[in-house]
Each structure stands twice: as structure tokens, then as C-alpha cells.
């Protein structure tokens, strides 16, 4: 007897693991036997190459590789979300629709919420190393490593809770370098290494001794970039200092550094970084094109010694390591307006003094360039005829022009009434799209 379709097996939410295909199951009853079709975010799948989906005779959907992300239905979606799949089973008596199954891809971000910090603990007392792992899907698990090996957790002495490692009673053997490792199916991330020093219970003479320490900061030298760090590394300096006073009571040294402000201006706050050395050490994470003040402070447990003298170093400017963003071309009255947004601040590599704008050859503008000085982020170019106008923009520091933006083009039509800049929701024309259009 004929009957309308009914979904017997609904597709399930799943994680695309790769490299093998993902499978979405769907089984339906009905007479005559229903035909199965699949939808992604409500849109039917074509199943025609290069579509990565393939339908098996039993209605199972094979996904050979992750689909390109469609339009998100939940605002600013996470990069983990690949979409919602539903299957439809149809015969002449009707159609049944399955529940939606969400396909996602594993993600593990790089930035730890809380990094473990160097610390000094006392024998017999408890201490905690905090760790907040990066965001991940699926949620990452946290494990702890000591001196490059997984930490053997001892019940009653070690507890890992919410990422943090609680040590019930510190022993001398707990001294070492600890690292928190976040792991999920996308991979793993390692925190910074935290140095844990264990000391015997102290009498109170040490801080007094520490006050007698004198530190002379002798040298601050700009280090040559390590080629292994890629073409645009952040600057680092080498600090060298001499210690005099009692017999080396300091257990660690901290660099204090800040950007120098204009004379008479309020000083920027000092940033602090624990140094991995007792007479010299590297200090990274600085910015090109800044004047810095540096000093060194000794410490022992919670006690701090007096700061060293201050040394100054000017880091040279470099060319910007990223192009201006959001470059747009808009038609005006006999002109074309070029506008842009500065490169991200972390890529300035100095003070941006202006911008270089180029027109590209083989278009209606002859090859030319313009210089825009100061903070202005737009330029008006006179146009004399219809045709295509293509430009690139680069930010300029004292070291020169940085990386140029991708070419952006504008097609001014004959009557100049209508200017085409955005082909069907795909953003500004690229040179390649423009050439393809002109060929057509």
C-alpha cells in the first residue's frame, strides 16, 4: 500500500576530521520508495563536480572535503561552522524533512587566556600554576609538562582544575620549567614556559641583603633578526648588566621598559618582562620606530631590589609590513575618489607619514603615482574619459613605502552615469576580474 515518506534515520551533528570523507546518513520509509535530496543551509546541493558532495544509493551523503562557508545565519559566525545539512525524502504522496545536522570543523586558536607565570614557592607550602587555554572547538583539554616531559600527576599532591595545576606540598624536586599544553582534534598549542623555583623556608635577612644589591645596566643592543622568524620579525634587544653587592642574593632579574614620551610629557607605564639570564638576556616584543627606555630590577621571591640605571635606545623605522586596508574607488564628477584605511597598528613599524598611490598601466590612466602626506586616507584623481581605472596604495614610514594593496579597479562607462565597482556582492573588482570582464 502506498504511504508518504517518513524519516527513519536523521543526520547527526558531526565534526569534519579529514583527510577521509565525512558521512551524513539519512534513511526514509515510504511507498513508492522516496527519493532523497540534500540541502545545505536550506539550499539544494547540486552534486555536480566541482561540488564536493556525493550521494550514495542508500541516501548517505559523502562530503569529500569541507564546503566553502556559506552565509552565516548567526551573525558574526565562528570559523568552525560549515553549515546545517537537512535531507528531504519525497514521493508522489509528499515530502518529509529531516532534522538539521550541523557540520563543523575543528579549530584551536593560538592565544592563551592565562599564561603560567614564573614563580618562587616554599618547600611544604602549596602553589598554583594558572593556565587558561585558547578557544577551541571541540573544547581543548589541558595537560602539564615539566622540563619537556609530560608531568606525572600524583593523586593527593597534584590537581588539575579548570586548566590550572595545584601542587599541594612543594618539594625541591618540583623545581623546573612548566608548560601548559592545550589539545583538541585540530592540534595542540603550548603555553610559555614558566620557571618554578623552590626554596627552603626563609629567615628575613634576604630582603635586607637584596636592598644592598647594585645593578649597572651596561649595554642595550639591537639584535639582528633571526631569518627563521620569517621576513618581518619583531625587534629584540640584548641587555647586559653587572651586579655588585652581597653574594648574588637575587634569584631573578626583570627588564622594565617603556616608550619614551616627549620631554615634559607624562611617562608611559613601565612594562615588565622576566629575563632568562643573570648577567645578560634577550628582550623581545618591541616595536620598530620607537624610542625606548630600559632598566633592570633584581628580585628574590616577593622581595625586590633597587632598579638599575636607565639606558635609551632608538629602534629604527622599517617599512610597513602590511598594506592599507579596505581600498575603494568611487566615481565623482569628472574624478575618481580613492579611499583606504591604514594598515593594522601592529604592522606600522614606525610612524606612518603618508601614502603612495599608483595607477597601473594598460588602463585609462597612464602609469603614475601620487604622494598623500600625513594622516589623510583619501585622494581625488581627475578623469578625462570612460574606461577602467586601477590603483594600488602603500603606507609610507621614514624607511620608505611598504607592501602595496591588491590592485582595485573601477569601470567608468561611456556616459559616466553608472560606474561598476561591485560585481554581484563580491566586493571591489580585482585586476583579474576586470580583465575577464573586458575580454567578454
Amino acid at each position: 500500500q502506498d504511504s508518504p515518506p517518513q524519516i527513519l534515520v536523521h543526520p547527526q551533528d558531526q565534526l569534519f576530521q579529514g583527510p577521509g570523507p565525512a558521512r551524513m546518513s539519512c534513511q526514509a520509509s515510504g511507498q513508492p520508495p522516496p527519493t532523497i535530496r540534500w540541502l545545505l543551509n536550506g539550499q539544494p546541493l547540486s552534486m555536480v563536480p566541482p561540488d564536493p558532495h556525493h550521494l550514495l544509493p542508500d541516501g548517505t551523503l559523502l562530503l569529500l572535503q569541507p564546503p566553502a562557508r556559506g552565509h552565516a545565519h548567526d551573525g558574526q559566525a565562528l570559523s568552525t561552522d560549515l553549515g546545517v545539512y537537512t535531507c528531504e525524502a519525497s514521493n508522489r504522496l509528499g515530502t518529509a524533512v529531516s532534522r538539521g545536522a550541523r557540520l563543523s570543523v575543528a579549530v584551536l586558536r593560538e592565544d592563551f587566556q592565562i599564561q603560567p607565570r614564573d614563580m618562587v614557592a616554599v618547600v611544604g607550602e602549596q602553589f598554583t600554576l594558572e593556565c587558561g587555554p585558547p578557544w577551541g572547538h571541540p573544547e581543548p583539554t589541558v595537560s602539564w609538562w615539566k622540563d619537556g616531559k609530560p608531568l606525572a600527576l600524583q593523586p593527593g599532591r597534584h590537581t588539575v582544575s579548570g586548566g590550572s595545576l595545584l601542587m599541594a606540598r612543594a618539594e625541591k624536586s618540583d623545581e623546573g620549567t612548566y608548560m601548559c599544553v592545550a589539545t583538541n582534534s585540530a592540534g595542540h598549542r603550548e603555553s610559555r614556559a614558566a620557571r618554578v623555583s623552590i626554596q627552603e623556608p626563609q629567615d628575613y635577612t634576604e630582603p635586607v641583603e637584596l636592598l644592598a644589591v647594585r645593578i649597572q645596566l651596561e649595554n642595550v643592543t639591537l639584535l639582528n633578526p633571526d631569518p627563521a622568524e620569517g621576513p618581518k620579525p619583531r625587534p629584540a634587544v640584548w641587555l647586559s648588566w653587572k651586579v655588585s653587592g652581597p653574594a648574588a642574593p637575587a634569584q631573578s632579574y626583570t627588564a622594565l621598559f617603556r616608550t619614551q614620551t616627549a620631554p615634559g610629557g607624562q611617562g608611559a607605564p613601565w612594562a615588565e618582562e622576566l629575563l632568562a639570564g643573570w648577567q645578560s638576556a634577550e628582550l623581545g616584543g618591541l616595536h620598530w620606530g620607537q624610542d625606548y627606555e630600559f632598566k633592570v630590577r633584581p628580585s628574590s621571591g616577593r622581595a625586590r631590589g633597587p632598579d638599575s640605571n636607565v639606558l635609551l635606545l632608538r629602534l629604527p623605522e622599517k617599512v610597513p609590513s602590511a598594506p592599507p586596508q579596505e581600498v575603494t574607488l568611487k566615481p565623482g564628477n569628472g574624478t575618481v575618489f580613492v579611499s583606504w584605511v591604514p594598515p593594522p597598528a601592529e604592522n606600522h613599524n614606525g610612524i606612518i607619514r603618508g601614502y603612495q598611490v599608483w595607477s597601473l598601466g594598460n588602463t585609462s590612466l597612464p602609469p603614475a603615482n601620487w604622494t598623500v602626506v600625513g594622516e589623510q586616507t583619501q585622494l581625488e584623481i581627475a578623469t578625462h574619459m570612460p574606461g577602467s581605472y586601477c590603483v594600488q596604495v602603500a603606507a609610507v614610514t621614514g624607511a620608505g613605502a611598504g607592501e602595496p594593496s591588491r590592485p582595485v579597479c573601477l569601470l567608468l562607462e561611456q556616459a559616466m552615469e553608472r560606474a561598476t565597482q561591485e560585481p554581484s556582492e563580491h566586493g571591489p573588482w580585482t585586476l583579474e576580474q576586470l580583465r575577464a570582464t573586458l575580454k567578454r
Epitope: G132, P134, W135
Partner: antibody, heavy 118, light 112 residues
Framework: EVQLVESGGGLVQPGGSLRLSCAAS????????MSWVRQAPGKRLEWVAT????????YYPDSVKGRFTISRDNAKNTLYLQMNSLRAEDTAVYYC???????????WGQGTLVTVSS | DIVMTQSPLSLPVTLGEPASISCRSS???????????LNWYLQKPGQSPQLLIY???NRFSGVPDRFSGSGSGTDFTLKISRVEAEDVGVYYC?????????FGPGTKVDIK
């Protein structure tokens, strides 16, 4: 459409407890970290708590650590804030907000008022 | 904890004119990976805060392009190229680089 609706606010005596809820809809709740932020009358916004997408990792400022507990039920698409040992300075409008990774709070609820007074 | 300061705390503006708000942190907001998590929010009278700019200079979807963010390290700026009537409210910066996350005191923008 992303929607966050807080409830559970009200008047409570100092030392008392209150549990706030935030019902989420319009997005896959279980893949987003979530936060609570509060605003005392006429004051700046103050971050109160954050919980990871799976609920394992929680973060608090010192001002509420040990007194407030953030939790979530991914099956019910609901975020909670259990507030114990309440003080007058906890009086505020409490907002729940969705996090993109741990980068920024993109959508906020309309808020629920908590008043701590004898 | 990171202390966030904003200036000015009050900003009377003329419609159609530009406006600029500064936000400073007591420590660099750039983390060891070179990422800076500084966001800007607008709280209109009687409403919840709404996101304008994330990670220093990225405009959130639906935010008009008259809003732009810039800065690095400890100094950040929100600019409105041409103020419109709907832009009135309190603007807050928020850093989420370091736990605890901290907001600035807010800058109240109103029309002259």
C-alpha cells in the same frame, strides 16, 4: 537572529544569594564562549565572568572570585550566574554577552537589574 | 590589573563634524603572539552596549564606515568622520588581552 534574554534579577539582602539565567537562541550556543558584564548605576561597565564553550574553563575578576560562579547548560542553551554573599556594591544591571572566540563580545542581552539592599 | 583611561570623558560635538576619542592602557595590550585585543562599544541611552570596533581597527558588521579605530601598544583612538544624531551615547573601550578584562570609564558624546 541572535537573541540573549536575561532573567532572575531582583531585590536581595546583603549576604543573600541570587541566580541569573540567560536564554540564548538564534545561534549554536555550544560553540561560543559566553560572559557576564555588569553596570552599576551611573558607572562604567565591569566584566564579571567568562565561561568557555564547553564549560570547563571559567574566568573571574578578583572582585567576585569565590562568590560568583558562571555555568552553562548547552542542552538547554542557557547561561547562568550564581551569586552568593552579595554586597551592596554588587547592585547593577547584569548583561550576558556572546563571545567570538575570546576576542570580543558581539551580542548583548537587554540586562536584568540586581539590587542588594537591606 | 590593566587600568584603562579615556579622554575626553565628555565630548560635545556638532552634527556633520568629526570626533575623536582616546583610550590608554596602563600596560601594552599586545600579547606574545603580536595580537592586540582592544574593542570599542557604544551604549546608547537606555540600551545595552553594541559592538563598533574589534581588535583595534576592524569594523563590526553593520557598523557605518564613518567609525574607524586605530592604535597600538598602549594608545588607541576611535574616530567618527562625520557625527550623526544617532551616534550620541557613551563610548567604552575594552581590553581582553589580559585577564581580568577591563573597560575604560566611558566617553559621553552629545550634540552641542
Amino acid at each position: 537572529e541572535v537573541q540573549l534574554v536575561e532573567s532572575g534579577g531582583g531585590l536581595v539582602q546583603p549576604g543573600g544569594s541570587l541566580r541569573l539565567s540567560c536564554a540564548a537562541s538564534g545561534f549554536t550556543f555550544s560553540t561560543y564562549a559566553m560572559s557576564w558584564v555588569r553596570q552599576a548605576p551611573g558607572k562604567r561597565l565591569e566584566w564579571v565572568a567568562t565561561i568557555s564553550n564547553g564549560g570547563t574553563y571559567t574566568y573571574y575578576p578578583d572582585s567576585v572570585k569565590g562568590r560568583f560562579t558562571i555555568s552553562r547548560d548547552n542542552a538547554k542553551n542557557t547561561l547562568y550566574l550564581q551569586m552568593n554573599s552579595l554586597r551592596a556594591e554588587d547592585t547593577a544591571v547584569y548583561y550576558c554577552a556572546r563571545l567570538i572566540y575570546y576576542d570580543y563580545l558581539d551580542y548583548w542581552g537587554q540586562g536584568t537589574l540586581v539590587t542588594v539592599s537591606s | 590589573d590593566i587600568v584603562m583611561t579615556q579622554s575626553p570623558l565628555s565630548l560635545p560635538v556638532t552634527l556633520g563634524e568629526p570626533a575623536s576619542i582616546s583610550c590608554r592602557s596602563s600596560q601594552s595590550l599586545e600579547n606574545s603572539n603580536g595580537n592586540t585585543y582592544l574593542n570599542w562599544y557604544l551604549q546608547k541611552p537606555g540600551q545595552s552596549p553594541q559592538l563598533l570596533i574589534y581588535r583595534v581597527s576592524n569594523r563590526f558588521s553593520g557598523v557605518p564606515d564613518r567609525f574607524s579605530g586605530s592604535g597600538s601598544g598602549t594608545d588607541f583612538t576611535l574616530k567618527i568622520s562625520r557625527v550623526e544624531a544617532e551616534d550620541v551615547g557613551v563610548y567604552y573601550c575594552l581590553q581582553v588581552t589580559h585577564v581580568p578584562w577591563t573597560f575604560g570609564p566611558g566617553t559621553k558624546v552629545d550634540i552641542k
